[in-house]
Structures are given as C-alpha cells and as structure tokens.
C-alpha cells in the first residue's frame, strides 16, 4: 500500500523555519519535516511522510523523479521519489541522481572521465509510462560531455532542467530533449487535462515562470473545450 511504502524507515530531523526547506516526501528513507503547530511556539517533527503527487519528473526536485511508489502500482498514484545513486537500476535518465545517467538499465557516472569527446547514448523517452516510447524504439541522440559541466544554453541537449541555464527548462523536442525558455506572461502554454498526456508531446513547452499560471485566455472562455487557448497569466 502507499502508506507502507511511505511510512517505513522514517528519520526525524531538526525542523527548519516555517515556510523554509522541509523534509523529503515519499522516498524509502526520508526526513520528516518540522512544523510550527498553530497556537504553539515550538517546532515538532512528524514521524511520517508527505507524499508529493506528480505527473512528470519536472514537478519533482532535482534529486527526485516521478513514479508510482509500488511496482505495478495504481496509475493514478505517482509521487516524487528519491533519485537513484550510481550502480542502481533505472529505466530513464531522470531516475538517476544528478551527475549520473541511465545506461543499460543502470545509473552510471556522467563524469568527464567517462566521456571521450562526443559519444552516442540512448535516450529512452517515456511517452505516458516508464516502459515504452511512441513506437517502441529508443531514439538515439548525441550528447556532448560538456553538457554535464556547464549549464546548457537555449537549444542545448539536456536530460533534466538542472542541466539548463537559468530561465530555461529541459523539454522534449522531436525525440530528444533540449533547453527551452521558461514561458513568459502572455505566451501560450500547455494545460495537461489528463494524467500522462504530457508524454505524447513531440514539441513540449516549458512551464510558466514564477508568479504565472497556465490558464484559459479570457476571450476564449466561450470556445469549445478542445479549442481553448491557454496562456501564462499573472495571479
């Protein structure tokens, strides 16, 4: 069950200030955050986990990936899980911790030493789930070794958004992923109506920037559901 996965091996930690960095939700071994209880004047810790639901890896932290907490688990339950360290099994790059990538089902180091100039590596894109691509085949993309050491500029190949420079995110473009600009106010955005639909995009857009949300454009409220245009709008 979800709780048994989430509530095993709890570690209590010293709590941060309210509104600051807290513990890690939904991993096998995790810190429980401190919370300032209303009416109280001291922090206490919680000896259980805080599952953080997600639809894709980008909604999780850089040290996490999005997946069902149990093998063959409920498709509607995906949470942020701790990334996998070197030599751990993986199905895609985002499962591996920063500085590693998924090769032949194992997280391996992406250190400079492991690359000789440019190498060809398989990027298996997940279109809706961890196990399949759009046509069942892996796409091959050339990755430059330097992408792991300098933040990618717009158009650079990436594995995750943390590979890209500030103001950019890592988004699907054909069969690879490249750094694209985070969307600004007024720009068209994609609102995923159902879980998993983000995986079908060949040209994926970034998310809206801080302080913006993807909403139906005011003058499109009367339009049919399928033709509604979403743009990044201020709160």
């Amino acid at each position: 069950t979800l709780n048994s996965v989430l509530n095993s091996n709890a570690i209590k930690n010293l709590p941060p200030p309210l509104g600051g960095a807290a513990g890690h939700p939904g991993s096998a071994v995790s810190a429980a955050p401190g919370i300032l209880y209303p009416g109280g004047n001291k922090y206490q810790t919680i000896d259980n986990y805080q599952p953080y639901p997600c639809a894709e890896d980008e909604e999780c932290g850089t040290d996490e990936y999005c997946a069902s907490p149990t093998r063959g688990g409920d498709a509607g339950v995906q949470i942020c899980l701790a990334c996998r360290k070197r030599r751990k099994r993986c199905m895609r790059h985002a499962m591996c911790c920063p500085g590693n990538y998924c090769k032949n089902g194992i997280c391996v180091s992406s250190d400079q030493n492991h690359f000789r100039g440019e190498i060809e590596e398989t990027i298996t894109e997940s279109f809706g789930n961890d196990h399949s691509t759009l046509d069942g085949y892996s796409r091959r993309t050339t990755l430059s070794s330097k992408m792991y050491h300098t933040k990618g500029q717009e158009g650079s190949v990436c594995l995750r958004s943390s590979d890209c420079a500030s103001g950019l995110c890592c988004a699907r473009h054909f069969w690879s992923k490249i750094c694209k600009p985070v969307l600004k106010e007024g720009q068209v955005c994609t609102k995923h109506r159902r879980k998993g639909s983000h995986g079908l995009e060949i040209f994926q857009r970034c998310y809206c920037g801080e302080g913006l949300s993807c909403r139906i454009q005011k003058d499109h409220h009367q339009a049919s559901n399928s033709s509604r245009l979403h743009t990044c709008q201020r709160h």
Epitope: G23, E59, G61, G76
Partner: nanobody, 125 residues
Framework: EVQLVESGGGLVQAGGSLRLSCAAS????????MGWFRQAPEKEREFVAA????????AYADSVKGRFTISRDNAENTVYLQMNSLKPEDTAVYYC??????????????????WGQGTQVTVSS
C-alpha cells in the same frame, strides 16, 4: 505573504459528509501540488491526501481511501477535500498545505512549504 485559509469544518454525525476548502492567496498555486493533513489530540500530524498541480495524480492515506476525495480548482486557487462516510476516528484538526514547485524552481526536494492554520472536524458517534 502566502496565506492558506481552510474552511468547511464542523460537527457531523458518523456516516455523514463534509467538504473542506482551502483558499490560497499571495502566490500562484496552480503550478504546485497541494495536500491535506490532520492532527488528532495527542497524536502527530498525519498525511490525508494530496493532489498534483494538474490534478492528474492524487495520493491518499490508506485510512481514508475510498471515502475522501481531493480535488482542486486552479482558476479559483482552491483545493477541496470531500469527506464521506465519516468515522469518529476522523476527528481532528485538518490542515491544508502547499508545495514548492520542485525542480521547476531550482529545489532539490519537492515538499510542502506552506501551511494553513487548520479547521476542526468533529465526528460524533
């Protein structure tokens, strides 16, 4: 300043229903997961339910699965918890929480950073 305000709590008989609401202000929450937690007297605060920013993924505590439903309205910046078939053991203060946006905003860990003050739910037998 970020504010989460819960409402909808109250006294209800076992088997009854309540709908909690959590209104968010001071920040755009449509890009962030939101959750409900509860704390009964003399017990630690526990997870109840959470929902992803898109509403596409939800998670529930085993104790409420099939009885409680979490939903959100991003246009209204509100998250809801529909509680059916309430039991006396559901009696607690219910807290709304909002997440931080994960790697989208440079965080290494996705987590709940903001909390409401809570609303009391009492289920009598």
């Amino acid at each position: 300043e970020v504010q989460l305000v819960e409402s909808g709590g109250g006294l209800v008989q076992a088997g009854g229903s309540l709908r909690l609401s959590c209104a968010a202000s001071g920040r755009t929450f449509s890009n962030y997961p939101m959750g409900w937690f509860r704390q009964a007297p003399e017990k630690e605060r526990e997870f109840v339910a959470a929902i992803s920013w898109s509403g596409g993924s939800t998670a529930y505590a085993d104790s409420v699965k099939g009885r409680f439903t979490i939903s959100r309205d991003n246009a209204e910046n509100t998250v809801y918890l529909q509680m059916n078939s309430l039991k006396p053991e559901d009696t607690a203060v219910y807290y709304c929480a909002a997440g931080n946006g994960g790697r989208n905003y440079g965080h290494s860990r996705a987590r709940y950073d903001y909390w409401g003050q809570g609303t009391q739910v009492t289920v009598s037998s």
